[in-house]
């Protein structure tokens, strides 16, 4: 087993400045062994609200690379293949958990972080504000 | 600070049967303090590929509640408000990290787990397979 480092600069479970410290086994268990999330990989092109994927990279974070969706158009693609601005392409966002070393450079001490990522885009009817 | 439980049924950092154990601070830092993920909360109704949100709850998991999207229709909503089956509503999926208590009921001992969640739905042009 791994011994939590005794480096005085790295926190231990008794440290009052390191609240709500828990032990986590980093051997990731995959609940979706029979599913392939990549089966939806071409939706970004086939969608009426298509999106591009941009690489968000941070080596100090796990996962280090997160692919972020950016909607290609303000409007949506209609049956003729043109952009219809009476509809709106909007990003679908989700908060995900990531790990970050804290303090930096301590090998076995981490902090959970929540980040908001855009996963894809959907086509919505716009909210129309009527002028009184 | 929290003391790692000495309950003999719960592992500690020296436990050889609990490999790659690290300390994680659960005081979650939110990188998106200026963003409100709920601003997109009505997209599920306004989308041309609307979805219902189902509560997936598991007290042994963190986060214990995850909202899962299920597309309401096979097709997409057209300009007349009817379902157009020439298009398909499909779920946008993403793999996310969660923490699972392991062994169960141990308050400060977790395992990383990867699960596939449906975040929302988008409307796509179907793939047509032509019979030769």
């Amino acid at each position: 087993g791994i011994t939590i480092p005794r480096n005085p600069g790295c926190p231990n479970s008794e440290d009052k400045n390191f609240p709500r410290t828990v032990m986590v086994n980093l051997n990731i268990h995959n609940r979706n062994t029979n599913t392939n999330p990549k089966r939806s990989s071409d939706y970004y092109n086939r969608s009426t609200s298509p999106w591009n994927l941009h690489r968000n990279e941070d080596p100090e974070r796990y996962p280090s690379v997160i692919w972020e969706a950016q909607c290609r158009h303000l409007g949506c693609i209609n049956a003729d293949g043109n952009v219809d601005y009476h509809m709106n392409s909007v990003p679908i966002q989700q908060e995900i958990l990531v790990l970050r070393r804290e303090p930096p450079h301590c090998p076995n001490s981490f902090r959970l972080e929540k980040i908001l990522v855009s996963v894809g885009c959907t086509c919505v009817t716009p909210i129309v504000h009527h002028v009184q | 600070g929290i003391t790692i439980p000495r309950n003999p049924g719960c592992p500690n950092s020296e436990d050889k049967n609990f490999p790659r154990t690290v300390m994680v601070n659960l005081n979650i830092h939110n990188r998106n303090t200026n963003t409100n993920p709920k601003r997109s909360s009505d997209y599920y109704n306004r989308s041309t590929s609307p979805w219902n949100l189902h509560r997936n709850e598991d007290p042994e998991r963190y986060p214990s509640v995850i909202w899962e999207a299920q597309c309401r229709h096979l097709g997409c909503i057209n300009a007349d408000g009817n379902v157009d089956y020439h298009m398909n509503s499909v779920p946008i999926q993403q793999e996310i990290l969660v923490l699972r208590r392991e062994p169960p009921h141990c308050p400060n001992s977790f395992r990383l787990e990867k699960i596939l969640v449906s975040v929302g739905c988008t409307c796509v042009t179907p793939i047509v397979h032509h019979v030769q």
Epitope: I28, S41, R55, Y62, S64, W67, H105 | R20
Partner: antibody, heavy 124, light 109 residues
Framework: QVQLQQSGPGLVKPSQTLSLTCAIS??????????WGWIRQSPGRGLEWLGR?????????DYAVSVKSRITINPDTSKNQFSLQLNSVTPEDTAVYYC??????????????WGQGTLVTVSS | DIVLTQSPATLSLSPGERATLSCRAS???????LAWYQQKPGQAPRLLIY???NRATGVPARFSGSGSGTDFTLTISSLEPEDFATYYC??????????FGQGTKVEIK
């Protein structure tokens, strides 16, 4: 099952361009769950990653700093293959060159499928 | 770039013995992005372990990986004749930082 088949000349003259091709079967060069890379191996340098291509709504190219100014990796979607071009070669570029599939999920990264390797000698 | 230092350079053991191979990184790497490969003469490397501790498909249970931070270990619990080969660790820190160790050769004593 996924297989990678390499082809290309085994002898290249100094200052010329080294060109190799890797044909993919059982997967797609445009797959969004993989990246396609080149790695070389020589007694002096050991295993050295050279670069990769991956497709995520557009093509991404990543090259090792050591060869960045001389390398190009291109996809050929019509033939489901990708190629390596290394310009201005010197005898130090003599090595066994491997193409490989890099599993590129958000949570893991590793090379699970390798080509058979091509010994390229740079000599006049 | 992160340097991976493998030790020992050569390990002389007999079939049935336990082999412990070390891989030390010059700075912290995410264990999830640490892999081990086996290579036999004239062959391409073969994936053994990914994510520091996950066995690849078809890899026998006698192979196991462990470690985090800067120190990683590949263990072969009981050497079989076909296990005598060279073993490499590999890390991915970022899209432009991917390096291999120099290898440990496991030879028959």
């Amino acid at each position: 099952q996924v297989q990678l088949q390499q082809s290309g000349p085994g002898l290249v003259k100094p200052s010329q361009t080294l060109s190799l091709t890797c044909a993919i079967s059982g997967d797609s060069v445009s797959s969004s769950s993989a990246a396609w890379g080149w790695i070389r191996q020589s007694p002096g340098r050991g295993l050295e990653w050279l670069g990769r291509i991956s497709y995520r709504s557009k093509w991404y190219n990543d090259y090792a700093v050591s060869v960045k100014s001389r390398i190009t990796i291109n996809p050929d979607t019509s033939k489901n293959q990708f190629s390596l071009q290394l310009n201005s070669v010197t005898p130090e570029d003599t090595a066994v060159y491997y193409c490989a599939r890099e599993v590129d999920s958000m949570y893991y990264s590793y090379f699970d499928i390798w080509g058979q390797g091509t010994l390229v000698t740079v000599s006049s | 770039d992160i340097v991976l230092t493998q030790s020992p350079a050569t390990l002389s053991l007999s079939p049935g013995e336990r082999a412990t191979l070390s891989c030390r990184a010059s700075q912290n790497v995410w264990a999830f992005y640490l892999a081990w490969y086996q290579q036999k003469p004239g062959q391409a490397p073969r994936l053994l372990i990914y994510g520091a501790s996950n066995r690849a498909t078809g890899v026998p249970a006698r192979f196991s990986g462990s470690g985090s931070g800067t120190d990683f270990t590949l263990t072969i619990s009981s050497l079989e004749p076909e296990d005598f080969a060279t073993y490499y660790c590999q890390q991915y820190r970022s899209t432009l930082s991917l390096t291999f160790g120099q290898g440990t050769k496991v030879e028959i004593k």
